[in-house]
């Protein structure tokens, strides 16, 4: 990536890392307003299976692994990207490496959920306080989950699907920060590991993933009021290990693996019309990216 200063623009969709033949160090940003891509400062270490989030206008890359010809190392790293300076800086590492991690943000704190270290599948969860640059363990999930989708709705943290080391999962659970406890919620209609999970209009969406047999293009959403999962329109492409985010009331899914190909496809979901459309392509196909949107 280029090391020049990033243009001072509005909300961008950032995609960090990923995998194609080996873990990648790319940081690129898509501007939905004009359809352009920016090539930004590379991650200091390549990684796939990471998660991305934004706190206080800074982009954080959390966990993952560096799968390269030289070896395969799961990552406990937390790195912070400043869009104003186009530079990465390391932060305090997590207590354990977490590949295929999920993350969510509540009250400016980053929650790192599940993931794997070697063949260990974590149920542990830890919270990062940016002001103190410290991680602290919180209550573990009821289920071990890697390839877990994580979303925050009404200051509650949801962990959806994943893989427990034996089975791909349709179960989901919810963390209550004030009580420091997890509770199971209604299971999805579909087993999904490596799904894209996000929140839009008071619903939790789970897109794609892998059911233990095939990649999925189906999408379902959870209504917290009725506690039910309902299918919406399917994506055009089957994909697991995809990136997902919400931008201006629409869901964007980026890349992933369809069982044959590492996808460069970016699709956008419009909830008003319940339709998916291809909006752009990434500069190259990849799975296992970390994705987030900068705040205004």
């Amino acid at each position: 990536g280029s090391m020049g200063h990033a243009p001072k623009v509005g909300r961008l969709i950032y995609t960090a890392g990923g995998y194609f033949r080996q873990s990648l160090s790319y940081l690129e940003a898509y501007n939905p307003s004009d359809g352009t891509w920016l090539d930004l400062a590379d991650l200091q270490v390549p990684r796939s299976g990471l998660a991305g989030c934004v706190v206080g206008g800074l982009l954080y890359a959390v966990g993952g692994r560096n799968n390269s010809p030289d070896g395969n190392t799961d990552s406990s790293a937390l790195d912070c990207y400043n869009p104003m300076t186009n530079q990465w800086s390391p932060c305090a590492p997590m207590s354990v490496p977490r590949n295929r991690i999920g993350v969510g943000v509540i009250d400016g704190h980053i929650y790192a959920v599940g993931g794997s270290h070697g063949c260990i599948h974590h149920n542990s969860v830890e919270r990062y306080e940016p002001e103190r640059d410290e991680w602290h363990l919180v209550a573990p999930m009821l289920t071990r989950r890697i390839g877990v989708g994580v979303a925050v709705l009404n200051r509650l943290l949801y962990a959806v699907g994943g893989f427990d080391g034996t089975n791909r999962l349709n179960s989901a659970e919810c963390y209550y920060p004030e009580r420091n406890e997890w509770r199971m919620i209604t299971a999805m209609n579909t087993i999904r590991s490596g799904a894209g999970v996000c929140v839009l209009h008071n619903c939790i969406y789970a897109a794609g993933g892998y059911d233990g047999q095939d990649q999925l293009n189906s999408v379902e959403r959870y209504d917290v009021e009725t506690e039910t999962w309902t299918f919406v329109a399917p994506m055009k492409h089957r994909r697991s290990a995809l990136g997902i985010t919400v931008h201006q009331g629409r869901i964007y899914v980026l890349g992933g693996y369809d069982g044959h190909t590492f996808l460069d496809s970016v699709e956008c979901y419009d909830p008003d019309t319940d339709t998916w459309s291809e909006v752009t392509r990434m500069t190259s196909g990849r799975s296992g990216v970390g994705v987030a949107v900068t705040m205004e």
Partner: antibody, heavy 120, light 107 residues
Framework: EVQLVESGGGLVQPGGSLRLSCAAS????????IHWVRQAPGKGLEWVAS????????LYAKSVAGRFTISADTSKNTAYLQMNSLRAEDTAVYYC?????????????WGQGTLVTVSS | DIQMTQSPSSLSASVGDRVTITCRAS??????VAWYQQKPGKAPKLLIY???SLYSGVPSRFSGSRSGTDFTLTISSLQPEDFATYYC?????????FGQGTKVEIK
């Protein structure tokens, strides 16, 4: 019945290339990780490469990284091992095997093996 | 890389004997160890996974156990068809590694 059948082995000169195939039946390769394991004549087993069906990520032994490529074609239910820049020390019987996730990467079904001989 | 040191490299035993083969991991591998049986000219066959779980269809005379980083395959009463070479494998961390094998021969 689950079966794995390797093919594509043979005699090749140092620096040459071969592509091994592993045709699966009785299960979908999209549902299992596929591994290649080799055994040099009179020696033990050496893990070579694997491919994850969920993420598409591949892993390689350091001895073959950059020279070998594992891939899978789910439409043909077949896995492949493309071997380039072959060396004498790559001479071995090559087995493909499947690992079901619940067995913590233990390979529960193996092919019969195909012999690769690298010699001038 | 994690080394799996298997012992003995060979042993002679009689039908009906109790046979024990050990693998020692150079560092913790949790319970991510499998045992295989291989006969000459044939592919390996899975016997034990997750250190102590008997794979389906494998006779109950085979068992596996773990004590820290030491893993043991036991054949409680050796049968004629059990004369073969046995390998342990760790899949705890990349790269997966095998022990060097133990050849069980007829005394």
């Amino acid at each position: 019945e689950v079966q794995l059948v390797e093919s594509g082995g043979g005699l090749v000169q140092p620096g040459g290339s071969l592509r091994l195939s592993c045709a699966a039946s009785g299960f979908a390769i999209s549902a299992s990780s596929i591994h290649w394991v080799r055994q040099a004549p009179g020696k033990g087993l050496e893990w070579v490469a694997s491919i994850d069906p969920e993420t598409g990520e591949t892993l390689y032994a350091k001895s073959v990284a950059g020279r070998f490529t594992i891939s899978a074609d789910t439409s043909k239910n077949t896995a492949y091992l493309q071997m380039n820049s072959l060396r004498a020390e790559d001479t071995a019987v090559y087995y493909c095997a499947r690992a079901e996730s619940g067995n913590v990467a233990a390979a529960d079904y193996w092919g019969q093996g195909t012999l690769v001989t690298v010699s001038s | 890389d994690i080394q799996m040191t298997q012992s003995p490299s060979s042993l002679s035993a009689s039908v009906g004997d109790r046979v024990t083969i050990t693998c020692r991991a150079s560092q913790s591998v949790s319970s991510a160890v499998a045992w295989y049986q291989q006969k000459p000219g044939k592919a390996p066959k899975l016997l034990i996974y997750s250190a102590s779980s008997l794979y389906s269809g494998v006779p109950s005379r085979f068992s596996g156990s773990r004590s820290g980083t030491d893993f043991t395959l036991t054949i409680s009463s050796l049968q004629p068809e059990d004369f073969a070479t046995y390998y342990c494998q760790q899949s705890y961390s990349f790269p997966s590694t095998f022990g060097q094998g133990t050849k069980v021969e007829i005394k």
